[in-house]
């Protein structure tokens, strides 16, 4: 009963003349444990007997013997673990046929059939490629033999082409009850070049014996395969020249569907064979053309072929670094004139002079001059030769105003008071003067650009200076405008004594002045409108009180002449001429009032006053007026007075007083 | 005709300050593309550029002393000068002052010389 | 930066020979360069010029030649007030001056 029985093996097992077969096998019986084991070599069922018939292999009696002759098969199994492996070494060519297992329990019974295919010589692994094998993406080639055996080591080797392939391979063996197999698994990366080439799978022995082979053609899907080709086969050419190109396909698999023609990238319109074919060829026409072929694996672009078209160099145009230039700053002119191949020499002009020694495409003036200003033109020079002279490029050259100077437009001399015209002039300027400045700043005219009106003219206005400005500002180096004047600051100043004058004294007095312009001059003394010296000093051996008053001291130069202010000059002296004198007379009629009044001339003034009688005997009295009231007849007689100031004494000579009678005196004697 | 004429201490201790003066007569350092250079030269050796002032104020300088290095002009005076700081005894030199006239291009050269003044550095 | 780089450091010539001296410079200088001569305890003096152009005064057994980085100063006939140093210089290299050429009477 089938149900019963649940055994399970490869079904086929394969081999060759002298090799080996190793069966996997286990069972599972329902009831009871198996009690014997028969291995049949094609076994029949004899319906009479109803028993199997056959050769029998190996028998598992009690003993456990084999028949004799069967020492070749070997039960590997057991009935404890229910395996049933078994093993034929070596195995011949008639061992093909069924197998039989006969299985027999306590109540079951079982003929389980494993087909054994053994041929002559060994058969050939099997080559496994994936459906699709495209350039570059990588894929794993199967080589698989359905035969392994414990007893007779294999290899598989892979060749491409007849050449061991450097790839490593994993080898794997099976032998398990669902499959016995041997398998090589290589991971591969088809390129193009691999497309019709014949990959095998050797199948080697122990000794490494080729025992048998496959093999399989590859189909390598790829691109197309480019080589391009120019004809004349110089890719560099010269203007008007006629060049082909032709866009060779060395392999595509499918064949190639569409062509076209690329320059520097972008497609070139109607250009769809694999000829491209340049008549007359122009500078525009330089450049990197390829071709690209497209297949249903892709597109595939030619190698890059730089085609150059040499031209002489065009007309040149300069190109400055900076224009307008200010003076002193760095300039660089570049010479631009397109040529191929490149110029190997240039020729700079400057205002159509060339320019020694400057050779190169790029010409740098370090520090720029004005003189440097003007139009800058190059020559360019190759191996087809010397370019067209562009027209030039201008290079303006800023710089302050140069060589400032001043000039004063007057007759000279100049005299204070005068109107003085001053111009700001200079050689060369650019940009053109805008405007002016002038040293020291004052409410002055410019009555035109550059022009400076000083009016009435002061006697300080020594230097002026002015700068003519554009972007810059340039300074002239100061005028000095030397303004003739009359002498200034006169003024009278006693040089000796140092203190107060005296009486006696020996005075000086000096005419001072600040400055005059010119310097020579002329004094003159005056006192009241008297002249009294023409010296710069004006001297008194012995100063007396007359000669004080008001003294002026003038200096004059070529231009006119200045007074000093009025200067006092004070003499101090004693009391003098001191004389005594009576308002109402020198005789007084008694009981009258009579006043003695000591007149003097000193200076300082007097401040004491003394006075004395005929016997010089001080009176009692200290004013300048001596009053007598009611003056009596007794009080006749001579008088003086004593005056006292600072410097000293000085006293009156004698008066005489007459006192006479009243009437009523007389009257009464 | 032109005349230039260094002036300076003759002797200086290390780490002192030199302060050269050029007295210049015969031509204007307001003129385009007038320099003065200052150029020394140590005995028995070759000479050495210092530094250049230009009309303009520019001042170029010895990239290998430019730290210790002032050069300054004033125009009115015609004079230029030089400064160098913490000088030393490899400093002992004969130091000139040139003219470079004005180029025709950037062609600088110097067509005066000073006579030169000699400076002793002791340590 | 542009170097000068004169050679000979010395030489050695007597009177009535001619010398040459020469100058490289490690970039196109476009002729800007110029020669001195220095005499014993004396200040050098201009001889040359913008590669060719001989100084004011300068007697004309002196010459200048060359280009872009080679320049030579040729003395012929050399004179007893020949012998001394001799500079070339390039103001816009660093340094501008060349290391000298020392030529002495032989």
């Known amino acids: 009963d089938s149900s019963k029985w649940n055994i399970e093996h490869p079904g086929t097992i394969y081999a060759w003349e002298g090799a080996c077969v190793w069966v996997p096998c286990t069972y599972r019986v329902l009831d009871g444990a198996l009690e014997t084991f028969i291995l049949f070599h094609n076994p029949e069922y004899n319906q009479n007997m109803s028993k199997f018939e056959g050769t029998r292999l190996y028998e598992s009696t009690k003993d456990g013997k084999v028949p004799s002759g069967q020492k070749r098969v070997q039960f590997l199994g057991n009935k404890i673990n229910n395996n049933c492996t078994l093993s034929i070494h070596p195995v011949h060519v008639n061992d093909s046929g069924q197998l039989g297992l006969r299985m027999v329990s306590k109540t079951e019974k079982w003929m389980e059939r494993i087909h054994l295919n053994v041929s002559e010589r060994p058969f050939p692994p099997r080559i496994q490629l994936p459906p699709k094998l495209q350039e570059s993406q990588e894929v794993t080639l199967t080589c698989l033999l359905n035969f392994s055996c414990y007893g007779y080591q294999i290899q598989l080797q892979w060749l491409l082409e007849g050449v061991p392939m450097r790839q490593a391979a994993v080898t794997s063996t099976s032998l398990s009850t669902k499959s016995v197999f041997t398998r090589s698994e290589l991971k591969f990366s088809p390129q193009w070049s691999h497309h019709g080439k014949i990959v095998t799978c050797e199948l080697h022995d122990v000794d490494g014996k080729v025992l048998s082979e496959d093999m399989v053609q590859l189909n390598v899907k790829h691109t197309p395969k480019l080589t391009i080709e120019v004809t004349p086969n110089e890719t560099i050419v010269r203007k008007g020249d006629s060049v082909t190109m032709t866009c060779k396909v060395n392999s595509s698999n499918p064949e190639y569907t569409t062509v076209s023609w690329l320059k520097d990238g972008i497609p070139l319109k109607e250009q769809n064979t694999l000829m491209l074919t340049l008549h007359e060829v122009t500078k525009s026409q330089t450049g990197r053309y390829c071709c690209r072929v497209s297949n249903d694996v892709g597109p595939a672009t030619s190698e890059k072929v730089f085609l150059q078209v040499q031209y002489a160099p065009e007309p040149s145009r300069v190109q400055i670094s900076q224009s307008p230039a200010v003076e002193g700053s760095e300039v660089n002119f570049l010479c631009i004139s397109p040529a191929n191949p490149l110029p190997t020499n240039y020729t700079w002009y400057h205002n159509g002079k060339e320019v020694q020694g400057r050779t190169e495409k790029q010409f740098q003036i370090q520090k720029i001059l004005p003189w440097h200003a003007g139009t800058y033109s190059c020559e360019a020079e190759n191996i087809l030769g010397i370019g067209e002279r562009g027209p030039g490029t201008e290079l303006d050259v800023q710089y302050p105003p140069k060589k400032v100077t001043m000039v004063i437009e007057n007759p000279t001399p100049i005299r204070e008071g005068d109107t003085v015209t001053l111009s700001c002039n200079y050689s060369s300027s650019n940009p053109i003067v805008n405007h002016y400045e002038w040293r020291p700043r004052g409410a002055w005219e410019e009555p035109s650009l550059g022009v400076l009106k000083i009016q009435n003219i002061g006697w300080n206005n020594t230097a002026v200076a002015c700068a003519a400005c554009n972007n810059w500002c340039s300074w002239a180096s100061p005028v000095t405008l030397n303004v003739l004047y009359a002498p200034r600051g006169v003024r009278v100043r006693k040089i000796k004594p140092l203190s107060e004058i005296h009486s006696g004294n020996s005075v000086s007095l000096q005419c001072d002045f600040s400055s005059s312009h010119p310097k020579e001059v002329q004094f003159f003394w005056e006192k009241n409108g008297s002249l009294l010296g023409k010296e710069s000093q004006l001297n008194f051996d012995s100063i007396s009180p007359e000669d004080a008053g008001s003294y002026s001291c003038w200096v004059n130069n070529s231009i006119g002449q200045t007074a000093s202010k009025a200067w006092t000059l004070e003499v101090l002296y004693a009391p003098r001429r001191l004389r005594v004198s009576m308002s109402q007379g020198n005789q007084v009629m008694e009981g009258k009032t009579a006043t003695l009044t000591c007149e003097s001339d000193a200076n300082p003034p007097v401040y004491s006053y003394a006075w004395f009688d005929w016997n010089n005997q001080s009176l009692p009295y200290s004013g300048r007026m001596l009053r007598l009231e009611p003056v009596k007849v007794q009080h006749s007689g001579a008088y003086w007075c004593q005056g006292t100031n600072r410097v000293g004494k000085g006293h009156s000579p004698l008066i005489t007083l007459t006192v006479y009678y009243s009437p009523q005196t007389i009257g009464r004697r | 005709q032109v005349t230039l004429k260094e002036s300076g201490p003759g002797i200086l201790q290390s780490s002192q300050t030199l302060s050269l003066t050029c007295s210049f007569s015969g031509f204007s350092l307001s003129t385009s593309g007038m320099g003065v250079s200052w150029i020394r030269q140590p005995s028995g050796k070759g000479l050495e550029w210092l530094a250049h002032?230009?009309?303009?104020?520019?001042?170029r300088y010895n990239p290998s002393l430019k730290s210790r290095l002032t050069i300054s002009k004033d125009t009115s005076r015609n004079q230029v000068f030089l400064k160098i700081t913490s000088v030393d005894t490899a400093d002992t030199a004969t130091y000139y002052c040139?003219?470079?006239?004005?180029?025709?291009?950037?062609?600088?050269?110097?067509?005066?010389w000073g006579q030169g003044t000699t400076l002793t550095v002791s340590s | 930066d542009i170097q000068m780089t004169q050679s000979p450091a010395s030489l050695s010539a007597s009177v009535g020979e001619t010398v040459t001296i020469t100058c490289r410079a490690s970039?196109?200088?476009?002729?800007?360069l110029a020669w001195y001569q220095q005499k014993q305890g004396k200040s050098p003096q201009l001889l040359v010029h913008n590669a060719k152009t001989l100084a004011d005064g300068v007697p004309s057994r002196f010459s200048g030649s060359g280009s872009g980085t080679q320049y030579s100063l040729k003395i012929n006939s050399l004179q007893p007030e020949d012998f001394g140093s001799y500079y070339c210089q390039h103001f816009w290299s660093t340094p501008p001056f060349g290391g000298g050429t020392k030529l002495e009477i032989k």
């Open positions: 040139a003219r470079a006239p004005p180029p025709n291009w950037d062609e600088y050269y110097f067509d005066y």
């Open positions: 970039g196109n200088i476009h002729n800007s």
């Open positions: 002032i230009y009309w303009d104020d520019d001042k």
